[in-house]
């Protein structure tokens, strides 16, 4: 009889453990933000991209905040940050201002408490995109593991924003918490 009770108790404890694990997982912060194609800046200079979707298509956010073009951390922790930026040009959409391009992405962390800004990751290349080629494409993917504090903000800067590929599977960035800070 006592064995049976112990087994039942273990099962109940186990299910509570699962539930606790699951609720903790559900509370784990994550975000996947996709470019808002209706509001991409023009030009060739380095700009901050402020228009991102957080709740449509592939875009989702949980226990993080998106505000004023920045992804805001709500929980201290170690996070994996990633960004994928695609640049493209087809001759039917116009001419290139220059055939020599620097196509770059910068993932930046801004701290409000101690006003400071740091580039966490950058990627890209200089490219020769001949005006005689009908189509050009280039993709950058960066990712890394960072300690982030509540209130810190993540933003994306790119060069040549007018060449951004506006598809949700092309230009996006995100973050997910991997573990707590000990």
């Amino acid at each position: 009889g006592s064995q049976h009770i112990r087994a039942e108790k273990a099962m109940v404890d186990g299910s509570w453990l699962d539930l606790a694990k699951r609720s903790k997982l559900e509370a784990q912060p994550f975000a996947h933000l996709t470019i808002n194609a209706t509001d991409i800046p023009s030009g060739s200079h380095k700009v901050s991209l402020s228009s991102w979707y957080h709740d449509r298509g592939w875009a989702k956010i949980s226990n993080m905040t998106f505000s004023n073009g920045k992804l805001i951390v709500n929980q201290d922790g170690f996070y994996y940050l990633y960004a994928n930026i695609c640049f493209r040009h087809h001759e039917t959409s116009g001419d290139l201002a220059t055939e020599y391009l620097q196509l770059m992405v910068y993932v930046t962390k801004t701290s409000i408490k101690i006003p400071s800004s740091h580039t966490l990751m950058k990627g890209g290349s200089t490219k020769y995109w001949s005006g005689n080629s009908e189509f050009h494409f280039y993709s950058i993917n960066v990712g890394g593991f960072f300690k982030l504090r509540s209130g810190e903000e993540i933003s994306i800067e790119v060069s040549n924003p007018s060449l951004l590929d506006p598809d949700q599977d092309a230009t996006y960035f995100g973050a997910f918490k991997v573990r707590d800070i000990d």
């Epitope: 023009s42 060739s44 039917t92 116009g94 001419d95 201002a97 001949s130 005689n132 080629s133 009908e134």
Partner: antibody, heavy 118, light 111 residues
Framework: QVQLVQSGAELVQPGASVKLSCKAS????????LQWVRQTPGQGLEWMGA????????KYTQKFKDRVTITADTSTSTAYMQLNSLRSEDSAVYYC???????????WGQGTLVTVSA | NIVLTQSPASLAVSLGQRATISCRAS??????????MHWYQQRPGQPPTLLIY???NLESGVPVRFSGSGSRTDFTLTIDPVEADDAATYYC?????????FGGGTKLEIK
């Protein structure tokens, strides 16, 4: 539809300068090179140079490099071509033009006749 | 600079017959698998109008009587059959490299 409207005919003295205008409409002015081509009875069609209106990048053919300045005003979608130190051989019809969505010059202004005469 | 030589300088063709105009470039105008040669028609007092782009592509609204062919340095504009309205001067142009250049023109007269 794409339209390029040029300024009126000019009669100028040798040694003087002329500044022609070309107002673009029907497309995003800052996304295409705007070209200048002239046509003289003796030389036929000659490509002079071009401007990319956004950043203002320019390119000129060697023959005109020292005498031509191409500019653009993005607020009015207007391009300008100034030709200095005019001589009689510069008497010509001057066209502004833009390529088509593929290639080739699909859009032309109506042309501006410049006559250089004392 | 790439020099474009058109021939003949003028030709007279009977109504309904074929007109052939040649354009030879001093060096290849091909790159990225395409030929950067275009053909224009110009009537007196008018700007040129684009007929053929990238050697063989018919510009929108241009009658199928007009066709272009060729690659690298040798290109041809063909009008078949010729109509009375085709009396004009025809120019080839390359934009493979700066400065863009034009041929000297071919004046077509209809007999």
């Amino acid at each position: 539809q794409v339209q390029l409207v040029q300024s009126g005919a000019e009669l100028v003295q040798p040694g003087a300068s002329v500044k022609l205008s070309c107002k673009a409409s029907g497309y995003t002015f800052t996304t295409y090179w705007l070209q200048w081509v002239r046509q003289t009875p003796g030389q036929g069609l000659e490509w002079m140079g071009a401007i990319y209106p956004g950043p203002g990048n320019t390119k000129y053919t060697q023959k005109f490099k020292d005498r031509v300045t191409i500019t653009a005003d993005t607020s009015t979608s207007t391009a300008y071509m100034q030709l200095n130190s005019l001589r009689s051989e510069d008497s010509a019809v001057y066209y502004c033009a833009r390529r088509g969505s593929r290639r080739g010059i699909a859009y032309w202004g109506q042309g501006t006749l410049v006559t250089v005469s004392a | 600079n790439i020099v474009l030589t058109q021939s003949p300088a003028s030709l007279a063709v009977s109504l309904g017959q074929r007109a052939t105009i040649s354009c030879r470039a001093s060096e290849s105008v091909d790159s990225y698998g395409r030929s950067f040669m275009h053909w224009y028609q110009q009537r007196p007092g008018q700007p040129p109008t684009l007929l053929i782009y990238l050697a063989s592509n018919l510009e929108s609204g241009v009658p199928v009587r007009f066709s272009g062919s060729g690659s690298r340095t040798d290109f041809t504009l063909t009008i078949d059959p010729v109509e009375a309205d085709d009396a004009a001067t025809y120019y080839c142009q390359q934009d493979n490299e700066d400065p863009y250049t034009f041929g000297g023109g071919t004046k077509l007269e209809i007999k």
